[in-house]
């Protein structure tokens, strides 16, 4: 037999096995020009010493073979003895190591068998009614195709599916969408309506994320508030990466899960912008305010479940220079200015009340005054901090108030509102004999003592009603008792107590009269 012809004799090796895991497979035969044809196949297993034979049976009932040697591709003309206008059955037999393995056969009309390409280029993936829709441009001059897909997950083998007949410039396929695992898809095409035409090669992998992006499992820690009034949010644990099928490992466009960090600054609600979304890799600096932080995972199908944390406000108060002066027109606060053209947010809320009851005021951008101070004033009519109770005040500053991550904490402190000097007056002053020349003076704690750092000291005043001599005794803010000594028996005294703040003298309590009885000895 001539090598260019199909040989109508017995092949030069024993009968073929019925097929095994190794051996020839994926036989494809096409017309490649007006009079030339090509068959190609793949061989699974060791290739040393393997001889391949392309077998062909004609509709007449005669069978022949081409010897391909070690090659897995063979071309022949329409003069090779194979009828190209009628149906033929072709398969490959491979002779190696004293055994013959055969491929599955293809039955086709060679003349009408055009080499079909798999979907080429961009395969668009979208979600449609809980299924996956893939769409691609039909390869040039190949309208009219049957399309199949195969898909696998990281833990399952390939499963085959059918896309049905296609007859347009764009082709599409509906495929199953997995809820929680990534999938790898491949597509192949063959000529529609051409009996037994060969399938194209499989397309490049299409990597598809699960419908639900994985819930982020991350942990945060927040550093201490620095001198600049900012603290760094750090990621303690990276989100787990999605497990990918074999063909999607490495570069797998389509399966990416994006993690975004959504910050919601709860403090200072009167500012312009309360939320900001950042990439998870870019960990922000925060002020000492309270925040809600959400990590949102999303993939090409949209966002998934998110994980939310609450970052409490930094309640570390400093004995800072917040100066408050109360005048007839109203109240003014002074504090060391941060920089030029800063916007300040002053937030206050009654101590012991829900954080949701915080009130705040935003200043216009201001420069420091000649003494380097920033100020905020309000009138009595505004009602701000007007009640006689303890308020927690926080002042935030930003040169760019529209940018959530550029706020810093200037100070946090306590302030007693309303008429503090009167409201702080100690009550229930009582005097008890202590010794022959001393008494113990007790009083109920001032309301100011409920406000950390506000009460500077108590002052106890003792007045000798005879000589009109007055003595004053400072008492630590934590004490509510003092012993007055060096008193004379039979003399009338009055005692009063007041509570002072750093910036305000208190109002004296009602005078309490007492005297030490003259002791008569027997």
């Amino acid at each position: 037999c001539r090598t260019s012809e199909c040989c109508f004799q017995d092949p030069p090796y024993p009968d073929a096995d019925s097929g095994s895991a190794s051996g020839p497979r994926d036989l494809r035969c096409y017309r490649i020009s007006s009079d030339r044809y090509e068959c190609s196949w793949q061989y699974e297993g060791p290739t040393a010493g393997v001889s391949h034979f392309l077998r062909c049976c004609l509709s007449s009932g005669r069978c022949c073979y081409f010897a391909a040697g070690s090659a897995t591709r063979l071309q022949f003309s329409d003069q090779a003895g194979v009828s190209v206008l009628y149906t033929v059955t072709l398969w490959v037999e491979s002779w190696a190591r004293n055994q013959t393995e055969k491929s599955p056969e293809v039955t086709l009309q060679l003349y009408n068998s055009v080499k079909y390409e798999p979907p080429l280029g961009d395969i668009k993936v979208s979600k449609l009614a809980g299924q996956l829709r893939m769409e691609w441009e039909t390869p040039d001059n190949q309208v009219g195709a049957e399309v199949q897909f195969r898909h696998r997950t990281p833990s399952s083998p390939w499963k085959l599916g059918d896309c049905g007949p296609q007859d347009d410039d764009t082709e599409s396929c509906l495929c199953p969408l997995e809820m929680n695992v990534a999938q790898e898809f491949q597509l192949r095409r063959r000529q529609l309506g051409s009996q037994g035409s060969s399938w194209s090669k499989w397309s490049s992998p299409v990597c598809v994320p699960p419908e639900n992006p994985p819930q982020p499992q991350v942990r945060f820690s927040v550093e201490q508030l620095g001198q600049d009034g900012r603290r760094r949010l750090t990621l303690k644990e990276q989100p787990t990466q999605l497990e990918l099928p074999e063909g999607c490992q490495g570069l797998a466009p389509g399966t990416e899960v994006t993690y975004r960090l959504q910050l919601h600054m709860l403090s200072c609600p009167c500012k312009a912008k309360a939320t900001r979304t950042l990439h998870l890799g870019k960990m922000p600096y925060l002020s000492g305010a309270a925040y809600n932080v959400a990590v949102i995972s999303s993939n090409q199908f949209g966002p998934g479940l998110n994980q939310t944390w609450h970052i409490p406000a930094d309640t570390h108060t400093e004995p800072v220079a917040l100066n408050i002066s109360v005048g007839t027109n109203g109240t003014t606060m002074y504090w060391p200015a941060r920089a030029q053209s800063m916007t300040y947010c002053i937030e206050w809320q009654p101590v012991g009340q829900d954080g949701g009851l915080a009130t705040c005021s935003l200043t216009a951008p201001q420069d420091p005054d000649p003494a380097g101070m920033a100020t905020y004033s309000w009138s009595r009519e505004s009602g701000a901090m007007g009640q006689e109770k303890c308020y927690y005040i926080t002042i935030f500053a930003s040169a760019h108030p529209e940018k959530l991550t550029l706020w810093s904490t200037v100070l946090s402190t306590y302030h007693f509102g309303g008429n503090a000097s009167a409201a702080g007056t100690p009550h229930h002053v009582s005097v008890k004999n202590h010794s022959l020349d001393s008494v113990s003076v007790d009083w109920a704690p001032s309301l100011l003592s409920t406000c950390p750092g506000v009460l500077k000291e108590y002052v106890v005043r003792c007045r000798d009603e005879d000589s009109k001599q007055v003595s004053e005794h400072p008492v630590q803010p934590t004490e509510t008792q003092v012993t007055l000594s060096g008193l004379r028996a039979g003399v009338a005294y009055t005692v009063q107590v007041r509570a002072d703040t750093a910036w305000l003298r208190g109002v004296w309590s009602q005078p309490q009269r007492f005297s030490i009885e003259v002791q008569v000895s027997d």
């Epitope: 109508f8 004799q9 017995d10 092949p11 009968d15 073929a16 077998r55 049976c57 007449s60 009932g61 005669r62 069978c63 022949c64 073979y65 059955t89 398969w91 037999e93 055969k102 056969e105």
Partner: nanobody, 111 residues
Framework: EVQLVESGGGLVQPGGSLRLSCAVS????????VNWYRQAPGKQRELVAL???????KYADDVKGRFTISSDSAKNTVYLQMNSLRPEDTAVYYC?????WGQGTQVTVSS
């Protein structure tokens, strides 16, 4: 001269088995398609199974899983192993290759 000779037919009970042989001369079973046909009384001849080039086997739907076609190239013979036989398998079984036919062998399935 091409000749095909069938043998192995007979009477068998439903559920039983038979093995038909087709001895071929003049052509090689490895370089041709050998078919088994059958014809029941009053019916048209129908293809039961075929073997192409001694390797590729095809079956009619109603015998799939019950009948097996095979070949022995050394003896140049094709076989049809018939299991789980049914009364409706009763027919004359013919072997053919190219345009040549054998004389047939009778298979009767009856209790």
């Amino acid at each position: 001269e091409v000749q095909l000779v069938e043998s192995g037919g007979g009477l068998v009970q439903p559920g039983g088995s038979l093995r038909l042989s087709c001895a071929v001369s003049g052509i090689s079973v490895r370089s041709s398609v050998v078919n088994w046909y059958r014809q029941a009384p009053g019916k048209q001849r129908e293809l039961v199974a075929l073997i192409m080039g001694g390797a590729i086997r095809k079956y009619a739907d109603d015998v799939k899983g019950r009948f097996t076609i095979s070949s022995d190239s050394a003896k140049n013979t094709v076989y049809l192993q018939m299991n789980s036989l049914r009364p409706e398998d009763t027919a004359v079984y013919y072997c053919s290759a190219l345009e040549y036919w054998g004389q047939g062998t009778q298979v009767t399935v009856s209790s």
